[in-house]
């Protein structure tokens, strides 16, 4: 996930927010799956 050629603060911020959103979605899916499997 190189996410482009820009290294300014806004580009870094947007990339960080994307990672957080992605991880939240992945962890949320895993949690729902665990609850479902119980």
């Amino acid at each position: 996930h190189s996410d482009g050629i820009f290294t300014d603060s806004y580009s870094r911020y947007r990339k960080q927010m994307a990672v957080k959103k992605y991880l939240a979605a992945v962890l949320g899916k895993r949690y729902k799956q665990r609850v479902k499997n119980k």
Epitope: S2, D3, G4, Y10, S11, Y13, R14, K15, M17, A18
Partner: antibody, heavy 111, light 111 residues
């Protein structure tokens, strides 16, 4: 290096439509991609973008009517509940800073 | 959503002269510098000129200069050339991308 939009056409109000963005000489999967539109004779309007992780952000006016998604080679803009106000040229562009634009694809919504 | 107000069109300049276009945001952009400038000629997609308020995009002539911070930004074109006749847009990036928006555009006429 270039990007290109496709899928624009004349549709009637309420008809859903999907636009596609493809690239030549660029690995699209390595870049965030944005969508922008421009009504005839009007200014630019930011629609939203998608990160390399597939997470999306949209302008507040979109109100869930548009959805951006991606595969390893394409980025798509799915549009629903279209009205005449959505008549515009739709552009896709590379990076959060929209550093490389396609020529655009014209969407006309008319009854 | 944010509102970006640009210098009213058209702005007229003589070849070799200087053009100044202002862009005012209704709220501070991210990190006080998340603002870009684009040039668009009729029938063409926009082209990124400046990002992060003052950083010149690749291949853009040094006669283009961006400045400003927070809510007030300026694009200056020194030694204006005939080729600079176009419409110029600013784009603000915000803490919440849902607020991202373009300014209304400023047409530059070169005499």
């Amino acid at each position: 290096q270039s990007v290109e939009e496709s899928g624009g056409r004349l549709v009637t109000p309420g008809t859903p439509l999907t636009l596609t963005c493809t690239a030549s000489g660029i690995d699209l999967s390595g870049y965030a991609m944005g969508w922008v539109r421009q009504a005839p004779g009007k200014g630019l309007e930011w629609i939203g973008d998608i990160s390399t992780y597939g997470t999306t952000d949209y302008a507040s006016w979109v109100n869930g009517r548009f959805t951006i998604s991606r595969t390893s080679t394409t980025v798509t803009l799915k549009m629903t509940s279209l009205t005449t106000e959505d008549t515009a040229t739709y552009f896709c562009a590379r990076d959060y800073w929209l550093s490389l634009w396609g020529p655009g694809t014209l969407v006309t919504v008319s009854s | 959503a944010a509102v970006l107000t640009q210098t009213p069109s058209p702005v007229s300049a003589a070849v070799g002269g200087t053009v100044t276009i202002k862009c005012q945001s209704s709220q501070s952009v991210y990190d006080n510098n998340a603002l870009a400038w684009y040039q668009q000629k009729p029938g063409q997609p926009p082209k990124l000129l400046i990002y992060a308020a003052s950083t010149l995009a690749s291949g853009v002539p040094s006669r283009f200069k961006g400045s400003g911070s927070g809510t007030q930004f300026t694009l200056t074109i020194n030694g204006v050339q005939c080729d600079d006749a176009a419409t110029y847009y600013c784009l603000g990036g915000y803490d919440d991308p849902a607020d991202n928006a373009f300014g209304g555009g400023t047409e530059v006429v070169v005499k």
